[in-house]
């Protein structure tokens, strides 16, 4: 498994203490070498990856990771039970949901087992390191002749998230952006009927439940077009095979629905 090292923009409060043996200035020992920084991210509060750059070690070293929660009932030191590897050398640790306590100070310690005095400890606020899954099930509704409403879903973390919507037309050279609060819906008040539109959304664990800096991946794009019903009522599909039903079929509202619903709709 090749682990990706992400940059932690989101943890201003992280502190690092290096416990190193002092050595005479004219001699260099492995124990004076700083250990790589550990970077942790909590993915949708389902699991957490804490990774480090194993290639920064002067020679391949299987560093070990221990963790605990400061000043809490979970302050017992735990060994990593699921290491991540990069070219057969430890480069991370994966913690499962039951081992994650977002609102307690997480302490992580990296150690060189061949040189036990060579260790580094970091304290992290996990609520600032949450990365949600990309929004899904994007749907578009025509509210009026010139107004579109975009809706989407997030798995599990709904009220904790803020969102960023990007949209563009086939005439545009750049995205237009709009921030959206926890309500996960966006209205475009003025739609040009001659243009095609593309929308995408990403989400962030901020500000109600944490102060994360990292956004989710972008959703799959969703498309809306001027003559979609005329050319083909099932044009402008979501990449996940979602299709448009024409206005007449939905009593005046255009909406994107799934392939399964589409089949059901035409048989009843």
């Amino acid at each position: 498994l090749n682990t990706t090292i992400l940059t932690p923009n989101g943890n201003e409060d992280a502190t690092t203490d290096f416990f190193l043996t002092s050595m005479p200035t004219d001699s260099l020992s492995v124990s004076t070498l700083p250990l790589p920084e550990v970077q942790c991210f909590v993915f949708n509060v389902e699991y957490m990856n804490c990774t480090w750059n194993s290639s920064s070690e002067p020679q391949p070293t299987n560093l070990t990771l221990h963790y605990w929660y400061k000043n809490s009932d979970n302050d017992k030191v735990q060994k990593c039970s699921h290491y991540l590897f990069s070219e057969e050398i430890t480069s991370g640790c994966q913690l499962q949901k039951k081992e994650i306590h977002l609102y307690q100070t997480f302490v992580v310690q990296l150690q060189d087992p061949r040189e036990p005095r060579r260790q580094a400890t970091q304290m992290l606020k996990l609520q600032n390191l949450v990365i949600p899954w990309a929004p899904e099930n994007l749907t578009l509704r025509k509210l009026s002749e010139s107004q579109l409403e975009l809706n989407w879903n997030n798995r599990f973390l709904n009220h904790c998230l803020e969102h960023l919507v990007q949209y563009r037309t086939d005439w545009d050279h750049s995205w237009t952006e709009q921030s959206v609060d926890y309500r996960h819906k966006f209205s475009l008040p003025s739609v040009d009927g001659q243009k095609r539109y593309t929308f995408r959304v990403r989400s962030r664990f901020n500000p109600l439940c944490g102060s994360a800096q990292h956004w989710s991946e972008w959703s799959h794009p969703i498309h809306w077009g001027s003559n979609s019903s005329k050319e083909n009522p099932f044009l402008f599909a979501l990449e996940a095979e979602q299709k448009l039903i024409s206005e007449e079929d939905l009593g005046g509202e255009q909406k994107l629905i799934s392939e399964e619903d589409l089949h059901h709709h035409h048989h009843h």
């Epitope: 960023l164 545009d172 050279h173 995205w175 095609r196 593309t198 794009p221 498309h223 044009l235 990449e239």
Partner: antibody, heavy 116, light 108 residues
Framework: EVQLVESGGGVVRPGGSLRLSCAAS????????MSWVRQAPGKGLEWISS????????DYADSVKGRFTISRDNAKNSLFLQMSSLRAEDTALYHC?????????WGQGTLVTVSS | DIQMTQSPSSLSASVGDRVTITCRAS??????LNWYQQKPGKAPKLLIY???SLQSGVPSRFSGSGSGTDFTLTISSLQPEDFATYYC??????????FGQGTRLEIK
């Protein structure tokens, strides 16, 4: 007159790094997302990366993801491409272009050669 | 990823000829298609965007048409300065943005 002028290309060994710059003038820089598009010698155009107007989001081609980083400085009307872990197949003329998916203006390009 | 295929790969024509270059997408891209012209040693130049809209400053002898998967670039009366390589490019499903392999237009 719109001008995009790239710099920073050169010869580098495999595994090495380079930082390309693009200086923009003649248009309102922060009204545009910006992109890098490359062209290997005698070959066609390949999109590499785009960044939005305020620098808050970026997209990358799979061929460079994790190795290249696009950034911009709107105060200085400048676009950048930090390239690391360079490979022989990255050898190309690198153009900066205005827009994220429709490229209205292009620079003449800066040549990057990756060779041992 | 969406693949863009241009045809022909190269063609020879004479000044005054009407020339058509086609571009086919591997799936529907609506009208999210742009055309560029590139002359040797020069940067590409945007000709047509949104399949059929002429970029400002581009001569009216250039036109684009098509929607869905099939698109054409037409030069109604070829001029000496039009001999170049032409590329189509889709921006419907991004990333990645993808270009056709190019069509080289040469003097007969």
């Amino acid at each position: 007159e719109v001008q995009l002028v790239e710099s920073g290309g050169g010869v580098v060994r495999p595994g090495g790094s380079l930082r390309l710059s693009c200086a923009a003038s003649g248009f309102t820089f922060d009204d545009y997302g910006m992109s890098w598009v490359r062209q290997a010698p005698g070959k066609g155009l390949e999109w590499i990366s785009s960044i939005n107007r305020n620098g808050g989001s970026a997209d990358y081609a799979d061929s460079v993801k994790g190795r290249f980083t696009i950034s911009r400085d709107n105060a200085k009307n400048s676009l950048f491409l930090q390239m690391s872990s360079l490979r022989a197949e990255d050898t190309a003329l690198y153009h900066c272009a205005s827009g994220e998916f429709r490229f209205d203006y292009w620079g003449q390009g800066t040549l990057v050669t990756v060779s041992s | 990823d969406i693949q863009m295929t241009q045809s022909p790969s190269s063609l020879s024509a004479s000044v005054g000829d009407r020339v058509t270059i086609t571009c086919r997408a591997s799936q529907s891209i609506s009208s999210y298609l742009n055309w560029y012209q590139q002359k040797p040693g020069k940067a590409p130049k945007l000709l047509i965007y949104a399949a059929s809209s002429l970029q400002s400053g581009v001569p009216s002898r250039f036109s684009g048409s098509g929607s869905g998967t099939d698109f054409t670039l037409t030069i109604s009366s070829l001029q000496p300065e039009d001999f170049a390589t032409y590329y189509c490019q889709q921006s419907y499903s991004t990333p990645p943005i993808t270009f056709g392999q190019g069509t080289r237009l040469e003097i007969k």
